[in-house]
């Protein structure tokens, strides 16, 4: 039994780091393998992650980390019974993938303005809480070419756009994702999408 693709890990910088790897053949990850992880610190103790299958030869492990700070560094040991298959390390702050925003809501009752709001996925005491920026994706269900991205570079989890920038009388969907420049993170997954029917009063044309 050998590791074909070494584990790569990303952290949500809150409570979970996810590591994925591939074995050289079909593997029952949960019965055959264990991933041990330990904070590099005098008083820390080793924790065990039981991996799950992720395709035939792929494995994934969700490492529980109830707290993360920028200095944290973990040792990782992948075991098959008594055999050490791979040894490595992982610094969560250098491999951050933020949590996806949630509770995306489209408020259509504000004059002819669309107000999109969502929730910051982090609690106020988490470092990323005040460092997230967002991308909002709006697209038409009727017209695949009607697809747009709005970059929200301020901290407030909301976006206002004129309803007239979208076509009237058709349905749109929106979703939002997040990233943090401070840790040069990857983008989060997209939030679940929300749907609304766009309608607004066309301005009266005078001739």
């Amino acid at each position: 039994m050998k590791v074909l693709q070494e584990p790569t890990c990303v952290s949500d910088y809150m409570s979970i780091s996810t590591c994925e790897w591939k074995m050289n053949g079909p593997t029952n990850c949960s019965t055959e393998l264990r991933l041990l992880y330990q904070l590099v610190f005098l008083l820390s103790e080793a924790h065990t992650c039981i991996p799950e299958n992720n395709g035939g030869a792929g494995c994934v492990c969700h490492l529980l980390m109830d707290d993360v700070v920028s200095a944290d560094n973990y040792t990782l040991d992948l075991w098959a019974g008594q055999q050490l298959l791979w040894k490595g390390s992982f610094k969560p702050s250098e491999h951050v993938k933020p949590r996806a925003p949630g509770n995306l809501t489209v408020h259509t009752n504000v004059s002819d303005t669309l107000l999109l709001t969502w929730s910051n996925p982090y609690p106020p005491d988490n470092y990323l809480y005040n460092h997230l920026t967002y991308a909002v994706n709006i697209w038409s269900e009727n017209d695949p070419a009607d697809f747009r991205i709005y970059n929200v570079t301020y901290l407030e989890p909301s976006l206002r756009i004129a309803a007239s920038t979208l076509k009237s009388g058709i349905s749109y969907r929106a979703r939002v994702r997040a990233w943090a420049q401070c840790y040069n993170t990857t983008w989060s997954e997209w939030s679940p999408s929300t749907k609304w029917h766009n309608s607004y009063r066309e301005p009266f044309e005078q001739h």
């Epitope: 820390s44 707290d67 993360v68």
Partner: antibody, heavy 122, light 107 residues
């Protein structure tokens, strides 16, 4: 409610031995690392020894290394400190304290016992 | 060994005063700095861990700050029950060392 109760202290002659115990209750003892910390009369706190939850890691202060032995029995929810070759300067109140193994607590000594007094004198 | 030096060794303040105690480490200890409160004849109690995190049940008038070698414990509005000796402690390197303590009294 978390409780740590030390016992075994008393008067002992220089060169003698004593075994301190710390009985734990109100939490899952086997999940926590444990320390011994002492305080000489009228003085400050001095760390003595540490043992990890599964006894795999043990540390001692240089002042007690080779004379003191820390151990634990998770089945009995108990921590011990075997003290040999005692000296007058070992006279102190001895406290047991736990640390959480969860990273969020960052390994501080979050609960302490009330202490047991060890007096080394002839 | 890392030396932990607290200042002042003792201080007298009035109820309602803002009180600051400092702790200096002889070398970088990251943020692994804890503060304990000990009342006469009692065991120490954890106040603040990892420089600035408040232990559960500790009043919000206590706060901590700093990093590296210089750390501060602040009591925003001194209360009569805060009369005690305060100790800082580093757990970044062996042996784990405490400051000599700061005895806080009411004027």
């Amino acid at each position: 409610e978390v409780q740590l109760v030390e016992s075994g202290g008393g008067l002992v002659q220089p060169g003698g031995s004593l075994r301190l115990s710390c009985a734990a209750s109100g939490f899952t003892f086997s999940d926590y690392g444990m320390h011994w910390v002492r305080q000489a009369p009228g003085k400050g706190l001095e760390w003595v020894s540490y043992i990890s939850s599964g006894s795999t890691t043990i540390y001692y202060a240089d002042t007690v290394k080779g004379r003191f032995t820390i151990s634990r029995d998770n089945a009995k929810n108990s921590l011990y400190l075997q003290m040999n070759s005692l000296r007058a300067e070992d006279t102190a109140v001895y406290y047991c304290a736990r640390i959480s193994t969860v990273v969020a607590k960052r390994y501080a000594m979050d609960y302490w016992g009330q202490g047991t007094l060890v007096t080394v004198s002839s | 060994d890392i030396q932990m030096t607290q200042s002042p060794s003792s201080l007298s303040a009035s109820v309602g005063d803002r009180v600051t105690i400092t702790c200096r480490a002889s070398q970088d200890i990251s943020n692994y700095l804890n503060w304990y409160q000990q009342k006469p004849g009692k065991a120490p109690k954890l106040l603040i861990y990892y420089t600035s995190r408040l232990h559960s049940g500790v009043p919000s008038r206590f706060s901590g700050s700093g990093s590296g070698t210089d750390f501060t414990l602040t009591i925003s509005s001194l209360q009569p029950e805060d009369i005690a000796t305060y100790y800082c402690q580093q757990i970044n390197a062996l042996p784990f060392t405490f400051g000599q303590g700061t005895k806080l009294e009411i004027k």
